[in-house]
């Protein structure tokens, strides 16, 4: 039978001779050279050679356990003379024995990691891992221990796990953002003589909101013309915040000051500046200077940092309103005046007043916009604004005169303003009433007395306050011996009545009745109108059948101022 145990061979042999492995030996071997030993399998004849007489095995090359830890070979012992095996072919193992010839190697040459600034001591940052190719089952060649070579006192590493943690309280990104930590992994459990490898860990502190906004100055001053329309930007202020990104976002607000209602502040979404804007129309003459208290605050606050103080700051903004030369301002938006239509030329109707609203109180002159008074009916005193007539008026021609008055600064004619003037012409009884139409009527030959043959209506161009009150009567020259009578109905109408029974068209075919119409106003106005009455033949229903073709022509009467 074969006589050997498992063979062990130390890796990385550096001697000048071949490395002795061991001896194959059969108990059939008498030492007379009759047996021949043969080796086959992993590396036989190349890595491993055998002395076929003695069975001694040697390794011809330096072996690396990390490349191949075990070699499986087969041994044969044969009788040289017969060529027959004296032992059954047998498999044996050469196990390569580990030495500490590999340093730990990190999975990454460079690690990058982030951790929030101001983190508590012991906050996890990142885990690094190193592997050692040596035999972990034998000795401490592959037992890795981690330590920190660079990066103290800021960070620490757990020796067994490679977990890097924060080691210093209140690490402030605003003070220092980047850290380069060097970690060593050493085998042999970290003992002397152990092999080591290193890696670099680049650690960035990420921002947290641990800084409030701060105004670089306590007071700002801006100027704006009083003419600035609402929405106009008048100045920018900027609070600085040492944080970044969302933590540096700033909201501005006006918290106090007499300009609270007059101004607004918005945040420029790109530059994080506060923009002061006009909110309402300004008036230099009312208020020349405003002060505002403007607050800058972080919209996103981390409660755990509130102990550091309020995350806001205030500044005073002084706004100086600049005077703008403004046009004169009339005392009213429009003026309504009235004047009797019988007013003489140069009669004063009323007056307008305009003032320069500026502090200078420049004097103004007045004029009438002639495009609105082409006939030059009115005029104005350029100095005191009195309106007077320059022509006679007639209410019946035009009741309202709509003109425009201009006020112009004497020292600066470019500054002018306009106001509408509505002038109402008041009625005077200067028109006589007249027939509403031309009256031509007929009477039947067989008419009875007191028969109504026509109703009369009158019109008057005047417009008395209490309404028209007309009276009707026959003209004095026709009143006696008339064939007709006038009946005043007291409702501004009158009726013509027959005065006798029967008319003869052959005797008188046409009557001309002069009727006096008077109004009841002061001074009384009257006029005489003529009614033509024809005598006609009628049927028994009173329907006209035929009339005389001709009519006498009499004057219709003149208007009289009774």
């Amino acid at each position: 039978s074969w006589m050997w145990n498992q063979f062990f061979l130390l890796e990385e042999y550096t001697g000048s001779d071949y490395q002795y492995v061991g001896k194959l030996h059969s108990d059939q071997d008498r030492g007379d050279g009759s047996l021949k030993y043969i080796l086959s399998g992993d590396g036989a004849g190349d890595l491993f050679i055998i002395n076929e007489n003695t069975g001694d095995i040697q390794a011809t090359k330096r072996l690396d356990r990390e490349e191949k830890p075990v070699y499986i070979l087969r041994a044969q012992a044969i009788n040289r003379r017969t060529g027959r095996p004296v032992e059954p072919e047998s498999e044996f193992i050469i196990k390569i024995h580990d030495i500490n010839d590999n340093e730990p190697i990190f999975t990454k040459e460079v690690y990058t990691a982030t951790v929030p600034e101001m983190s508590d001591v012991g906050t996890f940052v990142v885990q690094v891992t190193a592997t050692d190719a040596d035999d972990p089952t034998y000795g401490n060649s592959a037992k890795v221990v981690y330590s920190i070579l660079q990066g103290q006192p800021y960070f620490s590493v757990e020796s067994e796990t490679g977990i890097i943690k924060t080691a210093l309280l209140n690490m402030d990104r605003e003070n220092r953002e980047q850290y380069q930590v060097v970690i060593q992994a050493k085998d042999m459990g970290g003992q002397m003589g152990g092999l080591s490898g290193t890696t670099t860990v680049n650690i960035t502190l990420t921002d947290v909101n641990d800084n409030p906004p701060r105004f670089p100055q306590s007071t700002y001053q801006f100027k704006t013309p009083e003419s600035s329309p609402p929405g106009t930007p008048i100045g920018r202020i900027k609070a600085s915040d040492a944080d970044v990104g969302e933590n540096a976002e700033i909201e501005y607000s006006i918290t106090d000051g007499e300009g609270l209602d007059m101004f607004d502040v918005i945040t420029d979404q790109e530059t994080q500046e506060g923009i002061i804007t006009v909110k309402k129309l300004l008036d230099f003459e009312k208020k020349k200077v405003y002060t505002l208290k403007v607050e800058a605050s972080n919209p996103y606050v981390e409660p755990r940092f509130l102990y550091l103080g309020p995350f806001k700051d205030s500044a005073t903004v002084r706004i100086v309103v600049e005077d703008v030369d403004e046009p004169p301002v009339f005392s009213k938006l429009a003026y309504i005046l009235q004047i009797r239509e019988d007013a003489q030329i140069n009669t004063t109707i009323g007056s307008v007043t305009a003032q320069d609203p500026d502090a200078a109180r420049n004097p103004v002159k007045y004029s009438v916009d002639r495009h609105t008074d082409m006939d030059r009916i009115f005029n104005i005193d350029s100095g005191n604004g009195s309106i007077f007539t320059s022509k006679l008026l007639d209410r019946e021609t035009l009741l309202w005169h709509n003109i425009t008055v201009i006020a112009t600064e004497i020292n600066n004619p470019k500054q002018s303003s306009r106001v509408p003037l509505y002038i109402k012409v008041l009625d005077v009884n200067d028109n006589a009433p007249e027939f509403a139409e031309f009256y031509e009527t007929f009477v039947c030959e067989k008419a009875k007395a007191d028969q109504l043959i026509q109703t009369l209506h009158a019109v008057d161009k005047d417009d008395p306050y209490s309404g028209h009150q007309f009276s009707f009567s026959l003209a004095p020259e026709a009143a006696s011996g008339s064939n007709f009578t006038i009946q005043d109905n007291k409702d501004n109408t009158a009726g013509i009545l027959t005065r006798k029974n029967g008319y003869n068209r052959h005797e008188m075919s046409t009557y001309l009745l002069p009727v006096v119409i008077s109004d009841n106003d002061y001074p009384v106005q009257s006029s005489t109108g003529t009614v033509t009455v024809r005598v006609c033949a009628c049927d028994h229903h009173g329907n006209m059948q035929s009339c005389h073709a001709e009519a006498l022509i009499h004057p219709t009467g003149l208007s009289t101022g009774a």
Epitope: P233, I266, T267, D268, Q269, E270, T271, I275
Partner: antibody, heavy 121, light 107 residues
Framework: EVQLVESGGGLVQPGGSLRLSCAAS????????MNWVRQAPGKGLEWVGR??????????YYADSVTDRFTISRDDSKNSLYLQMNSLKTEDTAVYYC????????????WGQGTLVTVSS | DIQLTQSPSSLSASVGDRVTITCSAS???????LHWYQQKPGKSPKLLIY???YLASGVPSRFSGSGSGTDFTLTISSLQPEDFATYYC????????FGQGTKLEIK
């Protein structure tokens, strides 16, 4: 006077690419975020995207309909804004406007004359 | 995303009429973030009212804006011939969104 002049529009096949440019003048380009807005023929206005200023790392934002296909960039030294359009679809046919916000970077105060992009086979 | 819904979508009115257009947001927004635009055919949109209330430069005083939270309004007190156009509201929170537009036509 604020001026925005777009160029680079034209006819392109579906799947194709086009690059629009916008030349800005009359204001401090570096202090304003810039936008692209489009309007399909006979339709309403649709925001395409925005690029912020350098202080904000030139961050870009896009409408869902163009994300991963369109890219906005800017060259502050040239006062120019760009829109790179890839994988174009027929529904991208529109007039494209370059738009500057109002002061404070609110609203869309100044619009270019627009450039027509037609995507058709 | 914040949706903006304008009403009405179209509107016929006469010169001199008072017109109101509303814009309703799907969630509450600061008045600083709501703006109104006018667009005429073949032209670029024009900023009309910014930050809900303020008239943009050169815009006549017959235009006014109001509102807060989710409900905003554009009012034209007395329509003029040049006011017939399409009006859009828009909000500033990314992604920026516009209302669908209100077309104002001559009756």
């Amino acid at each position: 006077e604020v001026q925005l002049v777009e160029s680079g529009g034209g006819l392109v096949q579906p799947g194709g690419s086009l690059r629009l440019s916008c030349a800005a003048s009359g204001f401090t380009f570096t202090t304003y975020a810039m936008n692209w807005v489009r309007q399909a023929p006979g339709k309403g206005l649709e925001w395409v995207g925005r690029i912020r200023i350098k202080n904000n790392n030139y961050a870009t934002y896009y409408a869902d309909s163009v994300t991963d296909r369109f890219t906005i960039s800017r060259d502050d030294s040239k006062n120019s804004l760009y829109l790179q359009m890839n994988s174009l679809k027929t529904e991208d046919t529109a007039v494209y406007y370059c738009v500057r916000p109002d002061y404070g970077n609110y609203g869309l105060a100044y619009w270019g004359q627009g450039t027509l992009v037609t995507v058709s086979s | 995303d914040i949706q903006l819904t304008q009403s009405p979508s179209s509107l016929s009115a006469s010169v001199g009429d008072r017109v109101t257009i509303t814009c309703s947001a799907s969630s509450s927004i600061s008045s600083h973030y709501l703006h109104w635009y006018q667009q005429k055919p073949g032209k670029s949109p024009k900023l009309l009212i910014y930050r809900s209330f303020y008239l943009a430069s050169g815009v006549p005083s017959r235009f006014s804006g109001s509102g807060s939270g989710t409900d905003f309004t554009l009012t034209i007190s007395s329509l003029q011939p040049e006011d017939f156009a399409t009006y859009y509201c828009q909000q500033d929170i990314v992604p920026l969104t516009f209302g669908q537009g209100t077309k104002l036509e001559i009756k």
